[in-house]
């Protein structure tokens, strides 16, 4: 007897089948950050809540020290939203020196780090000029796309200025990934 | 004979396998809304088209009375885009009373209602200050993320001001969810 | 002997099972575009990188001549981000003629073309008024949703003004789809 005689004829298995509920998945939510001084060309990584409220990690997808660890190779959908808030920005051609934290832009980057590769890879970037006159401002940047990731890859979210990130609600700023 | 001898050796089934085409899914599109009085701390829910044009519900995912009903427990990707449009906004420190359609912010919330739990849970929020001087304005807010939902949960989309929602095209304002 | 005796009792197969790694998928990234004359009511399509860097197509999902070709019918998640950049925009009521790169709006449309159907279908639209005073500006528009597509459908991304698209980095402007 051949095994395939007993599988439905339409099954066409080319690769291991696996139950969807068993796939690596994570949804991380914002926590209070250390409000560091904004350095022009250095984008700090956010850290995240991984188990309270809406946050979870499952099926060997682990969170540690600002990184999501990819436990198996495959195609993942990766997403993040960061809500920024700030005071009136400086957006004229002539900038005034010494005006603290009135940014002309806000940026989110989802970055992949591979230990065997020296340079991190920027997977996704959302960047926006900010020119808000006359009031405080707030706005989200959303990113999401599919990437082929390898076991051992690490994902993080970097921002242009950590002190502008809205950490007040878990639904405003978040980061997630799931194996397709 | 043992049954597993006839399944491919790489199958590694840890949970019920199921055909992807059988999973609960919905994509809902905007319809003209009933104008409601804008209440400061109460965000009205949008209602949706669920079967015409690009809209559909399938595999026991049902739409009723502004809610998407979750037919089985699991991890879902939930998304929405709302396009807002309005007249010149008020964005100076001094606001003028009684200026209709001149918001200082626009907000979208995807909310989960669980009958056994008294308070709705905000899953996702996109909120943006609006400071547009000298012309009418329009802009989208997009949200999407993965959540562990339970059978019987209900999802809705709430907005800060229903009268600002662009209901003119099904591709501008929409709401969807699918079981992963 | 009946075949189902040899399948796990919880399998409940209603439709062909298939390995997830075998599903059509693509992530395309931006390349330098051919500048086209901006026509008011005609939105040009972007062309894309499909194999270098982060870009890939797999499992019969092919890219050709600005189109992603859908190789089999099913429900797909389709997404795109386009980052726009421009000089100071015109946003007063009175517009000045002949001012290049000073748009009053930016728009992204993900369009489906079905050969048997004369008119393209707009699946997703992100449109935003641009009123940036006193400086150059840049900002992304992100779109993503699920659609029931048919074998042979073609997907493209159209923009309101190709000359404003930021083609400088693969993480800023991208387009993808995957079978659920």
């Amino acid at each position: 007897l051949k095994g395939q005689e007993f599988a439905p004829s339409h099954q066409q298995v080319y690769a291991p089948l696996r139950a969807d509920g068993d796939k690596p998945r994570a949804h991380l939510t914002v926590v209070r950050q250390t409000p560091t001084q904004h350095l022009k060309n250095q984008f700090p990584a956010l850290h995240w809540e991984h188990e309270l409220g809406l946050a979870f990690t499952k099926n060997r997808m682990n969170y540690t020290n600002k990184f999501l660890l990819i436990p198996e190779s495959g195609d993942y959908f990766v997403y993040s939203q960061v809500t920024f808030r700030g005071m009136t920005s400086e957006c004229s051609e002539i900038r005034q020196a010494g005006r603290p934290n009135k940014p002309d832009s806000i940026t989110v980057v989802i970055t992949k780090v591979t230990d065997s590769y020296p340079e991190p890879t920027q997977l996704l970037m959302g960047t926006k000029s900010v020119c808000e006159v006359g009031s405080n401002w707030f706005q989200p940047i959303y990113l999401g796309a599919m990437f082929s990731l390898q076991e051992g890859d690490k994902l993080m979210v970097n921002v242009s200025d950590i002190s502008l990130v809205d950490y007040t609600k878990e639904d405003k700023t978040f980061f997630g990934a799931f194996l397709l | 004979l043992k049954g597993q001898e006839f399944a491919p050796s790489h199958q590694q089934v840890y949970a019920p396998l199921r055909a992807d085409g059988d999973k609960p899914r919905a994509h809902l599109t905007v319809v003209r809304q009933t104008p409601t009085q804008h209440l400061k701390n109460q965000f009205p829910a949008l209602h949706w088209e669920h079967e015409l044009g690009l809209a559909f519900t399938k595999n026991r995912m049902n739409y009723t009375n502004k809610f998407l009903l979750i037919p089985e427990s699991g991890d879902y990707f939930v998304y929405s885009q709302v396009t807002f449009r309005g007249m010149t906004s008020e964005c100076s420190e001094i606001r003028q009373a009684g200026r209709p359609n001149k918001p200082d912010s626009i907000t979208v919330v995807i909310t989960k209602v669980t009958d056994s739990y008294p308070e709705p849970t905000q899953l996702l929020m996109g909120t943006k200050s609006v400071c547009e001087v000298g012309s009418n304005w329009f802009q989208p807010i997009y949200l999407g993320a993965m959540f562990s939902l339970q059978e019987g949960d209900k999802l809705m989309v709430n907005v800060s001001d229903i009268s600002l929602v662009d209901y003119t095209k099904e591709d501008k304002t929409f709401f969807g969810a699918f079981l992963l | 002997l009946k075949g189902q005796e040899f399948a796990p009792s919880h399998q409940q197969v209603y439709a062909p099972l298939r390995a997830d790694g075998d599903k059509p998928r693509a992530h395309l990234t931006v390349v330098r575009q051919t500048p086209t004359q901006h026509l008011k009511n005609q939105f040009p399509a972007l062309h894309w990188e499909h194999e270098l860097g982060l870009a890939f197509t797999k499992n019969r999902m092919n890219y050709t001549n600005k189109f992603l070709l859908i190789p089999e019918s099913g429900d797909y998640f389709v997404y795109s981000q386009v980052t726009f950049r421009g000089m100071t925009s015109e946003c007063s009521e009175i517009r000045q003629a002949g001012r290049p790169n000073k748009p009053d709006s930016i728009t992204v449309v993900i369009t489906k073309v079905t050969d048997s159907y004369p008119e393209p279908t707009q699946l997703l639209m992100g449109t935003k008024s641009v009123c940036e005073v006193g400086s150059n500006w840049f900002q992304p528009i992100y779109l993503g949703a699920m659609f029931s597509l048919q074998e042979g459908d073609k997907l493209m991304v159209n923009v309101s003004d190709i000359s404003l698209v930021d083609y400088t980095k693969e993480d800023k402007t991208f387009f993808g789809a995957f079978l659920l």
Epitope: V31, R32, Q33, T34, P35, T36, Q37, H38, H47, E49, L52, G53, R85, G86, M87, P100, N101, D161, S163, L164, Y167, T168, K169 | - | -
Partner: antibody, heavy 120, light 107 residues
Framework: QVQLQQWGAGLLKPSETLSLTCAVH????????WNWIRQPPGKGLEWIGE???????NYNPSLKSRVTISLDTSKNQFSLKLTSVTAADTAVYYC??????????????WGQGTLVTVSS | EIVLTQSPGTLSLSPGERATLSCRAS???????LAWYQQKPGQAPRLLIY???SRATGIPDRFSGSGSGTDFTLTISRLEPEDFAVYYC????????FGQGTRLEIK
């Protein structure tokens, strides 16, 4: 050694605006949250709100409509304004530094406290 | 907001005894955000424990903290005369809150 020194009017009439200032000595504004906390006589502590070096504020929802916290980086000072005060706002008001490092957060330095009494 | 409930309201003990103070949260709290403070009359609060279990600089080792989720405990292994004061637990989420306090008095 970081020191927080605070001052402001101690006696107010109902409907007036409470105004307090806290000076930070021996430390940087950057990298911390700068808080106001109050304690009514014989009662517990209530967090009022905070500001970071970027001027971004976060307020107790119950007081949000009446509170403004601001900072003056040039003087290493931050300030509290509470409008439309009533007798219920009578309390000792403290400024405090909020320290957050690698997800651990706490108030590590406190001002000496200022008793504010609201009475007609 | 997260409500912290401390018990008992007042604890009467003698020097040399062991004191156990409880703090219960209305919902789960990150352990790393849970702190304990001591306050004496006319003074500002003083940090004792942070991250639920780490002693602040200069705090004697008779003070210890434990717990996770919604239940946290401050223990003083052998009470010294200077330990009689009011103790507050505090969570440092996006909207920080304090417990109502436990008064530790000499029996």
């Amino acid at each position: 050694q970081v020191q927080l020194q605070q001052w402001g009017a101690g006696l107010l009439k109902p409907s007036e605006t409470l105004s307090l200032t806290c000076a930070v000595h021996g430390g940087s504004f950057s990298g911390y949250y700068w808080n106001w906390i109050r304690q009514p006589p014989g009662k517990g502590l209530e967090w009022i709100g905070e500001i970071n070096h970027a001027g971004i504020t976060n307020y107790n929802p119950s007081l949000k409509s009446r509170v403004t916290i601001s900072l003056d980086t040039s003087k290493n000072q931050f300030s509290l304004k509470l409008t439309s005060v009533t007798a219920a706002d009578t309390a000792v008001y403290y400024c405090a530094r909020g320290y957050c490092r690698s997800t651990t957060c706490y108030f590590d330095y406190w001002g000496q406290g200022t008793l504010v009494t609201v009475s007609s | 907001e997260i409500v912290l409930t401390q018990s008992p309201g007042t604890l009467s003990l003698s020097p040399g005894e062991r004191a156990t103070l409880s703090c219960r949260a209305s919902q789960s709290v990150r352990s790393s955000y849970l702190a304990w403070y001591q306050q004496k009359p006319g003074q500002a609060p003083r940090l004792l424990i942070y991250g639920a279990s780490s002693r602040a600089t200069g705090i004697p080792d008779r003070f210890s903290g434990s717990g996770s989720g919604t239940d946290f405990t401050l223990t003083i292994s052998r009470l010294e005369p200077e330990d009689f004061a009011v103790y507050y637990c505090q969570q440092y989420g996006s909207s920080p809150t304090f417990g109502q306090g436990t008064r530790l008095e000499i029996k």
